[in-house]
Amino acid sequence: LNLAYPTSPWRFKLFCAPPSTTDDSFLSPAGVPNNTSSLKGASEALVEAKFNSTGIYVSELSKTIFHCCFGNEQGQNCSALTGNTEGKTLASVVKPLVFRQLGVNWDIECWMKGDLTLFICHMEPLLKNPFKNYDSKVHLLYDLPEVIDDLPLPPLKDSFQTVQCNCSVRECECHVPVPRAKVNYALLMYLEITSAGVSFQSPLMSLQPMLVVKPDPPLGLRMEVTDDGNLKISWDSQTKAPFPLQYQVKYLENSTIVREAAEIVSDTSLLVDSVLPGSSYEVQVRSKRLDGSGVWSDWSLPQLFTTQDVMYFPPKILTSVGSNASFCCIYKNENQTISSKQIVWWMNLAEKIPETQYNTVSDHISKVTFSNLKATRPRGKFTYDAVYCCNEQACHHRYAELYVIDVNINISCETDGYLTKMTCRWSPSTIQSLVGSTVQLRYHRRSLYCPDNPSIRPTSELKNCVLQTDGFYECVFQPIFLLSGYTMWIRINHSLGSLDSPPTCVLPDSVVKPLPPSNVKAEITINTGLLKVSWEKPVFPENNLQFQIRYGLNGKEIQWKTHEVFDAKSKSASLPVSDLCAVYVVQVRCRRLDGLGYWSNWSSPAYTLVMDVKVPMRGPEFWRIMDGDITKKERNVTLLWKPLMKNDSLCSVRRYVVKHRTAHNGTWSQDVGNQTNLTFLWAESAHTVTVLAINSIGASLVNFNLTFSWPMSKVNAVQSLSAYPLSSSCVILSWTLSPNDYSLLYLVIEWKNLNDDDGMKWLRIPSNVNKYYIHDNFIPIEKYQFSLYPVFMEGVGKPKIINGFTKDDIAKQQNDAGEQKLISEEDLGGEQKLISEEDLHHHHHH
C-alpha cells in the first residue's frame, strides 16, 4: 500500500490546482477508487479563483474533482499517487508560482491533543484571501485500522468515517475522536475541500496519533527566590500525560541590565542565578514529549514576578527549638544596592541583633545566624518573629519570618488489659500557633525491644490519629507485638517544610494498664472490727502485681484513704477503721510490681453491710423523773435515756435491760425491749439502777449506774446557780459547789420551759467544770426552770433549782456582730464574775 506522506508528519502544506487542459482526468486520492461521490459539508474558507493563463473560471469547472498534493516550504516536489493497482508513483515537479496562482493552497498542522482523546487538524490558507469567498466546505475522512498491512488493496471507501470541519474566514479545524485504546494505531485520512462547486482532495495520509501528541500548556507557573538567592521558576507536572516531557522556558529579565533567555529542561523547575532586588521577570513555559516526537504545546500564559527592594533568602524559616537558623539579605535603596557591611539586623523591630551574629557573604549579601533557638511566643495575631534587615539609617517595612516550634511532644502509650491493642495519645498544644500545619504520627517497629537511642528512619509508617474532645490525638495500634519496640515521633508538615519531634520508643509490654481486680468484697469483721477487703487478680498480665486499696465512708463526697499491698500473692487485706457501724465503699486497683506500666482503673465499688461487730461499747446515759410526794418514802421513778448511737452500740441495739440492786431485794433485771424509758417504785433507802444495751453479739460491758438514796437526796452540794441568755439559741449556766465528803461523779443539768408542754431536757456534764453553754431554742421572755443535780457515787444529791433567767438590771446592747446581746460583762456582778468576756466571745463564735 503506497501512501503519500507530508514532509513533516504533523505540519505540511497542501497545494491544490486544476489540471492542464491536456490532462484526461485528475487523479483520485491515493488508493481510493475513483467513482466516489463528492462529499457534503459546510465551509467558509475556500475561494473563487480566476485562472489568468487560461481565462477559465473555477465555477465553469463544477463537478470536477481536482487533485492536491503535499509540498515543502518552497512548493517543490509536489507529489501525488496514482490510483493504479501497481502502486507506482506519478510525481511531477511544479513550480510554486503555479500553485500560488492557479490553486487553493493550505498550511496544515495536525496533532494529538494532550489528554489523548482527540486528533486535531488545523488549516489556514497560505494566501491572505486573494479570492472572493464562496460557501466552502471541508471534510476529513479517516479510518483507524489496527495494522495497515491487513487493509484491502485498495482500501474501501466505505471503511472511512467523515467529520465536518469547523471553518471561519481565516481557518478550519477538524476534530477526530480517537478512542484511548487506539492511540497507537495508524490513522488513515484525507481531506476533501469543496468550494463553489469545485472539489479538491488531498492524498491519503497515514499518522500514528501517539507520535504527534501536542501536550496542554503547563499550569501553575510560579516563581520564588530560593534560600540561596536564586530565582526558582517552577510549574506543575502534567499527571495526565503517560510519557515523560521536556519543557522550554523563556524569560525576560528586566534588571540593571535586560536579558532574554530560553532554556530546555526535563525537570519541572529552572534556576536563574544572581537575582537582584528590584528586578522583574516575565516567564512562559511550554512542553513536548521528552523523546522529541510530537508537537510543542502552546506557551503558558505569561507570569510576571518582581523582586522586592529588600530581598530575604530564605524569606521564611520554620525550625525547631534548640536549632540554628540563618537569613541572608540584599538591600537596594534608591536604585543602589547597599554594601553588606552597612547592613544591621533587628528582631521584631524591638531589639537589635548583636553584630557577632552577622556574616558577610559577598559585597552585597549579609547573613545573620541564630543559635539554640527558643520557641516563638505568639504576639497577638503574629505567630512568628519578624527579622528585619536594615541599613544603618532605616529599616525597610519588609521582613523575614522566623517560626520556631517546640517539637518536644510527649507521646504516651497504654496497652489495654487484654494485651490486644496499644493506644497512644499526644497533644499538639505546643504547635498550635503554627497555622496551616498538619500533624501526623509516624513510626517504625523493631522486631524485639527498643534501641538504646531511638532514631527517625526514612522508611516509616503513618498512623491514623483521631482528635479527641480534650484536645489530644489518639492513635490505636492493633494488633500489637508485645515485645517489639515501636519508635514513634510526630511529624509537623507545613508549606515551609516539615519538622519531627524527638523519637520515643515504646514497648507495649512495658505500658500495660491491667484490667482492674475483680470480685472485690468488703466486710467489717466481727470482734476484731477490721475492714477486710478481698479480691481476685486479673488474668493479664502474667507479671507479679501490686495492689492499692482505697476506702472511705460512703456518701456524696468520699474522703478516700489508701492502703498499699506489695505482696503479689496476696488476695486480701484487713484495715483498721474509725467507724465500725458505717457503710464503707471500697475499690481496688493494680499495676505491675516492677513499676512498669500504669495503674488499672479502680474496680467496681464494694460496700460493707452494717452489722453488729462487737458488744455495745457502753450502755446508754440515763436520767430520771420523780413523781409523787417528796415526803413519802415510796416514789415512782421514771428512767429516761437516749437511744444509743451506732458508734456506741456497734452497731445496733436489740433491747435494753435495766438492772436493779437494793439491800433488801438484792439484784434483778427488767427487759425493756427497745423502749427508752422505764418506771419503777423506789421504796428502799438506796436503790441502784444500771441500763445495759444488748445487740446480737452481747451486752454492753461499760455501763452507767445511778443510785437513788434518801440520805443523799438531802446533801446540799450546789451553792449557787445562775442562768444568762446569750441569744435565742444559747444560755450560759454557771454555778459554785460547796465542799463535801462524797465522791462527785458528774453533774446533771435539767431545764424546761415552764410555759410550754415540751417536757424536761437534760445533760450529763463533767464534775470539774463550773459553767456550761446550753444550746437550745430559748425564748428570752418566757419562763424557764434550770436545775443542777450533783451525782455522787453514793447517790443523787439535792438539786439547785432556779426559775427564769437570773434577774439583773441588764442594759440591752448590740454586740460587735450586731446581734442582740442580752448580757454583757459589766452586767455580771459578784458571784457572776464566773462568766467572763471570754465566755461571751465563746458564744459568738460557737
Epitope: 441568755p725 435565742s728 415552764l754 421572755i781
Partner: antibody, heavy 117, light 108 residues
Framework: EVQLVESGGSVVRPGESLRLSCAAS????????MSWVRQAPGKGLEWVSG????????VYADSVKGRFTVSRDNAKNSLYLQMNSLRAEDTALYHC??????????WGQGTLVTVSS | DIQMTQSPSSLSASVGDRVTITCRAS??????LNWYQQKPGKAPKLLIY???SLQSGVPSRFSGSGSGTDFTLTISSLQPEDFATYYC??????????FGQGTRLEIK
C-alpha cells in the same frame, strides 16, 4: 378564763408621749412573759416589745428601740408600754399578748394609738 | 432578722373546700412556727404552735406541717367561720418575733 384588756390609746401629735396599760386576769401573771404587738390600719401584725416573767429581760423591735419602754407590775397583774417621741408610723392598734410557744397564745382586743399633726 | 413570706396573699374558696396556705422562712427555723387567725375587728387567735401542734380549743380541721423553711396550714373542709386573715410567725430566732404579711381568705 384568760383576759387581757388594753387601755391608754388616744390621738397624739408627733413627738408626744403616751403610756399604754394592759390588765391581765384568769392566769398566774408572774408565770408568763408578755408582749406588745401592733397592727397599723389595714396592715399586718408587727411585734413591738416583750418582757420576761420577772421583768429581768426586755426586748424591742428596731423600729421602736430607744423610744419605747416596756414594764410590768406583777403585784397589779399589769403590763405597760411607755411610748415617747411618737411618729406618724406608730399609728396602730396596740395589742398586749401572753407570751407562749415563742409567740402569743392569748391577745387583748387592742387600744388605738393615732399619731397625727 | 428572719423574713417570713406567705402565699398566696389572698384567696377565694367555698365552704367545704380544702385550703392550703404556705409560709416560707428566709432561713431554716426547724419547727419553730406558729399560725394565727384574725377576723376583722378582733384580736388574733393562736391556731397551731410548733409547726404542727394544735392549740387547745381549735377545731381539728386545722392542721400544720413542714420544717426547715417551708410550712403549710391546711383547712380540710372550709366552714363559714373560717373566712379570715391568717398569719404565720417564727419563734426560732427571737427577738425579734417576725410575722408573715398575712393571707386573706375570702368567700368565693
Amino acid at each position: 378564763e384568760v383576759q387581757l384588756v388594753e387601755s391608754g390609746g388616744s390621738v397624739v401629735r408627733p413627738g408626744e408621749s403616751l403610756r399604754l396599760s394592759c390588765a391581765a386576769s384568769g392566769f398566774t401573771f408572774d408565770d408568763y412573759g408578755m408582749s406588745w404587738v401592733r397592727q397599723a390600719p389595714g396592715k399586718g401584725l408587727e411585734w413591738v416589745s416583750g418582757i420576761s416573767w420577772n421583768g429581768g429581760i426586755t426586748v424591742y423591735a428596731d423600729s421602736v428601740k430607744g423610744r419605747f419602754t416596756v414594764s410590768r407590775d406583777n403585784a397589779k397583774n399589769s403590763l405597760y408600754l411607755q411610748m415617747n417621741s411618737l411618729r406618724a408610723e406608730d399609728t396602730a392598734l396596740y395589742h398586749c399578748a401572753r407570751a407562749r410557744y415563742g409567740g402569743a397564745d392569748y391577745w387583748g382586743q387592742g387600744t388605738l394609738v393615732t399619731v397625727s399633726s | 432578722d428572719i423574713q417570713m413570706t406567705q402565699s398566696p396573699s389572698s384567696l377565694s374558696a367555698s365552704v367545704g373546700d380544702r385550703v392550703t396556705i404556705t409560709c416560707r422562712a428566709s432561713q431554716s427555723i426547724s419547727s419553730y412556727l406558729n399560725w394565727y387567725q384574725q377576723k376583722p375587728g378582733k384580736a388574733p387567735k393562736l391556731l397551731i404552735y410548733a409547726a404542727s401542734s394544735l392549740q387547745s380549743g381549735v377545731p381539728s380541721r386545722f392542721s400544720g406541717s413542714g420544717s426547715g423553711t417551708d410550712f403549710t396550714l391546711t383547712i380540710s373542709s372550709l366552714q363559714p367561720e373560717d373566712f379570715a386573715t391568717y398569719y404565720c410567725q417564727q419563734s426560732y430566732s427571737t427577738p425579734p418575733i417576725t410575722f408573715g404579711q398575712g393571707t386573706r381568705l375570702e368567700i368565693k
